[in-house]
Amino acid sequence: EAHKSEIAHRFKDLGEQHFKGLVLIAFSQYLQKCPYEEHIKLVQEVTDFAKTCVADENAENCDKSIHTLFGDKLCAIPKLRDNYGELADCCAKQEPERNECFLQHKDDNPNLPPFQRPEAEAMCTSFQENPTSFLGHYLHEVARRHPYFYAPELLYYAEKYNEVLTQCCTESDKAACLTPKLDAVKEKALVAAVRQRMKCSSMQRFGERAFKAWAVARMSQRFPNAEFAEITKLATDVTKINKECCHGDLLECADDRAELAKYMCENQATISSKLQACCDKPVLQKSQCLAEIEHDNIPADLPSIAADFVEDKEVCKNYAEAKDVFLGTFLYEYSRRHPDYSVSLLLRLAKKYEATLEKCCAEGDPPACYGTVLAEFQPLVEEPKNLVKTNCELYEKLGEYGFQNAVLVRYTQKAPQVSTPTLVEAARNLGRVGTKCCTLPEAQRLPCVEDYLSAILNRLCVLHEKTPVSEKVTKCCSGSLVERRPCFSALTVDETYVPKEFKAETFTFHSDICTLPDKEKQIKKQTALAELVKHKPKATEDQLKTVMGDFAQFVDKCCKAADKDNCFATEGPNLVARSKEALA
């Protein structure tokens, strides 16, 4: 239904607290460099205005679209051009072009310092002094670093943060209580960020149809007892919600997400037997719980997929009459039978099926032509299964850090032109797949591994798109989203690459490395490893092992020395000389 005042409608639906949080996220994702205090002023102004519209929907400007209202606020910021350069040009445009322009200026890799978690004592002091400001800062810090973070989900993580701080700040050892709990929230949130970025990439590059296909496959796996019509309705709603969030319509997105949760809880009988526990929770937790819900049990009496999609004499007729519906039905039927496959794999199979019908239905004897299609799926299924097997075996042998290093060597050889920080970030994230997925039961490994890798590779593509340097990466990133991971897996050493000359300063270290936290130490070592590979792309595993082992011993020795600075200064050049020799 149409509302006189969109902003009043959203304020009433969402409530003041969530409304303010979402407006803060929206502003932080659009203008990523502004300090919190500047944004919170705008949030308060927008909230006060929304309240006047709730009181009187006919009040001045209350009929304006939310994009218009938000855009006008952002464009009124003093010194916008000084701080944001050409983003200020967006302000000369009218809606909807102005919002599109803002979206195009979102920066996936903003020049912001990595967010350092404050000491437990300081967090608790500031949280207890002003919980609202503290959590506002959390929303701001995450949103500006992740401009596509799924806004209603970010509100959920802020709520989790609140719970953890409320619980831990009364403990005597605050740090012991906070650290593991906040680490767990952070890990989940970072994965959520890359997954959502992939959804927005899918929407931006390939449109709603591609995203809806993803949603059909995912929903069918989760809710195998639901009818195709029900799955289609859910997929359509999820597509609309994600389109809104990816497009910056955060209030509408959050409101629609709450509506979808309400619908699912009112229609459990036709969706899944597993929803009840989620449906007893408050709105943010309910939506999150539904998004993470375990798969329902597969119906026992499902017939073979071949009956309707290979053996039926009407296959070509059914396909010709309604291609999208027929392919959607195929995707639904195949996905509900295979919770053990990744969504990417299911979409590749559906694509293969579509290509087969396109070819065969134009031939003289279609059934003879498409009769072997299911057998032709076999290599497509085997490839990711082998990927999981070999990578999980390697992870089990090397552990997370060693596995990350193996991935880093592999990817630096595939795309040595990519900047070292980007390669290190990608390899560290790709390497975490072992910890995340390889410990799961067999049936859950493949979907976990492949869908996670796809999301991480999408991040690599997004960063590479900003400054393209590798033709191979561009090629893999330009193709279909579901073919990306196989494309990257198939890349070999880039033979066109001219090795980087050896620069001693790249491998010169100082005593400051000794006081770094373990994670930062690892990043320093991995940076050196990537640089070594760029210098010697064809170095053997043994050569790299020797040099990195030597390097680790050198750091260890000098960090234990009485005069650390002197040790680094004298032993460093020896290490460089030995490394050059080992790689000669």
Partner: nanobody, 117 residues
Framework: EVQLLESGGGLVQPGGSLRLSCAAS????????MSWVRQAPGKGLEWVST????????YYADSVKGRFTISRDNSKNTLYLQMNSLRAEDTAVYYC??????????WGQGTLVTVSS
């Protein structure tokens, strides 16, 4: 790395005013309680004032109460100390410090305030 850089010190006559600033970098400023501490020539350290992370609570040593005002601008990562009605005994090097539990884990280099006619 963490840096605290004080500025605004100088020579001022008794009864005059000065405003000290402390620019913080290398850490997330807003969640930290911040303080000013001073050291008069030949004396030990003396705590002057403390401000809570969002500025809603301030504390002062009796010797400066009513004359000094501590404030902060979290958007600029800056701590301030407005000093009015200055006296000769306020002459000291003023340090800003990042507070942690019962002590301070980082100090600035200090800025010298001299009150003399």
């Amino acid at each position: 790395e963490v840096q605290l850089l004080e500025s605004g010190g100088g020579l001022v006559q008794p009864g005059g005013s000065l405003r000290l600033s402390c620019a913080a970098s290398g850490f997330t400023f807003w969640p930290y309680t911040m303080s000013w501490v001073r050291q008069a020539p030949g004396k030990g350290l003396e705590w002057v004032s403390t401000i809570s992370p969002f500025g809603s609570t301030t504390y002062y040593a009796d010797s400066v109460k009513g004359r000094f005002t501590i404030s902060r601008d979290n958007s600029k990562n800056t701590l301030y100390l407005q000093m009015n009605s200055l006296r000769a005994e306020d002459t000291a090097v003023y340090y800003c410090a990042k507070k942690l539990s019962n002590g301070f884990d980082y100090w600035g280099q200090g800025t010298l305030v001299t009150v003399s006619s």
